[in-house]
């Protein structure tokens, strides 16, 4: 501790002349007291006949020092090393706004050299975050900003973000951006970014977690294209027809809005009625021809088929045998005594 009542240290120490001023091979470094663990400060100087610590402008008592001495092989000059401990109590007892500091002073015959000041601070990390991330519901592909202001701490807390307990590394996933003020930006929210996000603050004393913010990336529904119009409800005359579409382009997701508007459209339709074809009356029989047949015909014109109506079924021509008129039998029939006269039939005539 600080030497408050003991023997005062001299301002200079006798030493053989012609030595250079001491220079520090090791200077005390800033340190933090974690919980109640004292910190050790180290110092090494060359050439040095004496080396002591001063804290907050006062010499540290000799009994507080642990000193070692060695010789520099190249020059034969003395290297001195000193170590002290600083306790939490000592730091807490310091009044005023200035941080607790210590520095080394080394002597040689040429004079004294002072080291840099090392500052000793009591480390802590408060429990409550100054700002915690809030839950967000965002549309697909939009930007998200999650804010975090960590608890006050010494040393200042480092911040990392967790996505479902995994540390976010913007170098690995460039859709994430971390800022110096600890904001997390999701550049273009993907469905896979629907997750729980936690801000974690940590320093040498403790690690604190913010409340978890749930980010939901939703998709609003979109209509598909209209289907074709249905056939008219009446085959003939006035009726109705409809067409439909579905909310599937895309379908709503994660609480996204359903499509606005009608899924079904209906409209009046008028279909011209089909007219089936019908035959005209048969014509009169023709005169008996040389082939012993006569004919009659008809047409599908009473009425003709219209607007997709059916065609007439049946034949256009009708024929039958006749015997009035000159009928010539073929040569084979006349000359062949074995041939029998053929019975008349509907489409064969005997002459």
């Amino acid at each position: 501790g600080i030497d408050s009542g003991g023997q005062a240290l001299p301002d200079s120490f006798p030493s053989a002349p012609a030595e250079q001023l001491p220079h520090f091979l090791l200077e005390p470094e800033d340190a933090y007291i974690v919980k109640n663990k004292p910190v050790e400060l180290h110092c090494r100087a060359f050439p040095a006949t004496q080396i002591y610590f001063k804290c907050n402008g006062e010499w540290v008592s000799q009994k507080g020092h642990v000193t070692q001495e060695s010789l520099d092989e190249a020059t034969g000059l003395r290297i001195r090393e000193v170590q002290i401990e600083v306790s939490r109590q000592q730091v807490e007892e310091l009044f005023g706004l200035e941080d607790y500091w210590c520095q080394c002073v080394a002597w040689s015959s040429s004079g004294t050299t002072k080291s840099r000041r090392a500052y000793i601070r009591i480390a802590y990390l408060r429990k409550n975050f100054d700002q915690e991330p809030l839950a967000k519901e965002v549309p697909l592909d939009h930007e998200v900003l999650l804010q975090c202001r960590p608890p006050e701490g010494v040393p200042v807390a480092e911040v990392e973000w967790l996505k479902n307990e995994d540390v976010i590394d913007p170098a690995q996933d460039t859709n994430f951006l971390l800022t110096i003020d600890h904001n997390l930006i999701i550049r273009q929210a993907r469905l896979s970014d629907t997750a729980n996000y936690t801000c974690v603050a940590k320093n040498i004393v403790a690690k604190r977690r913010s409340t978890t913010a749930t980010v939901i990336v939703y998709v609003n529904g979109g209509w598909s294209s209209w289907a074709e119009w249905s056939p008219c409800s009446n085959r003939c005359g006035r009726g109705w027809q409809k067409r439909t579409r579905t909310c599937t382009n895309p379908a709503p997701l994660n609480g996204g809005a359903f499509c606005e508007g009608q899924a079904c459209q209906k409209t009046a339709c008028t279909t011209v009625c089909p007219v089936d074809g019908a035959w005209t009356e048969w014509s009169k029989w023709s005169a008996c021809s040389t082939e012993c047949a006569h004919w009659r015909s008809r047409e599908c014109m009473a009425p003709p088929p219209q607007n997709g109506g059916r065609d007439c079924s049946g034949t256009l021509l009708d024929s039958k045998n006749c015997t009035d008129g000159l009928c010539v039998l073929n040569q084979r029939t006349l000359n062949d005594p074995k041939s029998r006269p053929l019975e008349p039939s509907g489409d064969v005539a005997l002459y």
Partner: antibody, heavy 115, light 106 residues
């Protein structure tokens, strides 16, 4: 199609005020950060201010802090920059840009501060 | 604020040349660096974000890389439409831009 259109620029005397507008279309401004960036004649780009409506977040460059105010009217899908106590060094083309990546920019509006 | 020191301030190059522009951040900015192209009288256009991600619609001859606090924009084969001014920008702290690099025809 995403589009940003700035308006409101013009000539103003030192100490005067001006309000710039940035009308956004093709996206919902509520879910994006919006930024104002300026460019003095023949000079480089300088960030001025940012807003993210959903998180009620605003941020300003030191050079304009206390003089300029960024805001947004999400019902109009428009961001604004209210500029007070204008100085000659505020003379620049003012651009609005969308998102932290600044992926879309407006065409710019010229603000001239001169007596 | 974080400074972005861009170099060179200008360069002359020919069509087909490989062009490299660098930016050095005054402190760590993670990978939060973007590159923009600006032509006279026009608004800047985003080329690269997150140090090395090519923005959609940008030709693949543009690329970005990072080494610690040094960031590089490379145009592998300069095209006539690439003559412009290029800016780097960091978004880790309050946004700051580099001073710009003017790429001119040799």
């Amino acid at each position: 199609e995403v589009q940003l259109v700035e308006s409101g620029g013009g000539l103003v005397q030192p100490g005067g005020s001006l309000r710039l507008s940035c009308a956004a279309s093709g996206f919902n401004l509520y879910y994006y950060s919006m930024h104002w960036v300026r460019q003095a004649p023949g000079k480089g780009l300088e960030w001025v201010a940012s807003i993210y409506s959903y998180s009620s977040y605003t941020s300003y460059a030191d050079s304009v802090k206390g003089r300029f105010t960024i805001s947004a009217d999400t019902s109009k899908n428009t961001a604004y920059l209210q500029m007070n106590s204008l100085r000659a060094e505020d003379t620049a083309v003012y651009y609005c840009a969308r998102s932290y990546a600044m992926d879309y920019w407006g065409q710019g509006t010229l603000v001239t501060v001169s007596s | 604020d974080i400074q972005m020191t861009q170099s060179p301030s200008s360069l002359s190059a020919s069509v087909g040349d490989r062009v490299t522009i660098t930016c050095r951040a005054s402190q760590s900015v993670s990978s939060a660096v973007a590159w923009y192209q600006q032509k006279p009288g026009k608004a800047p256009k985003l080329l690269i974000y997150s140090a090395s991600s090519l923005y959609s619609g940008v030709p693949s001859r543009f690329s970005g890389s990072r080494s610690g606090t040094d960031f590089t924009l490379t145009i592998s084969s300069l095209q006539p439409e690439d003559f412009a001014t290029y800016y780097c920008q960091q978004s880790y702290g309050p946004f700051t831009f580099g001073q710009g690099t003017k790429v001119e025809i040799k």
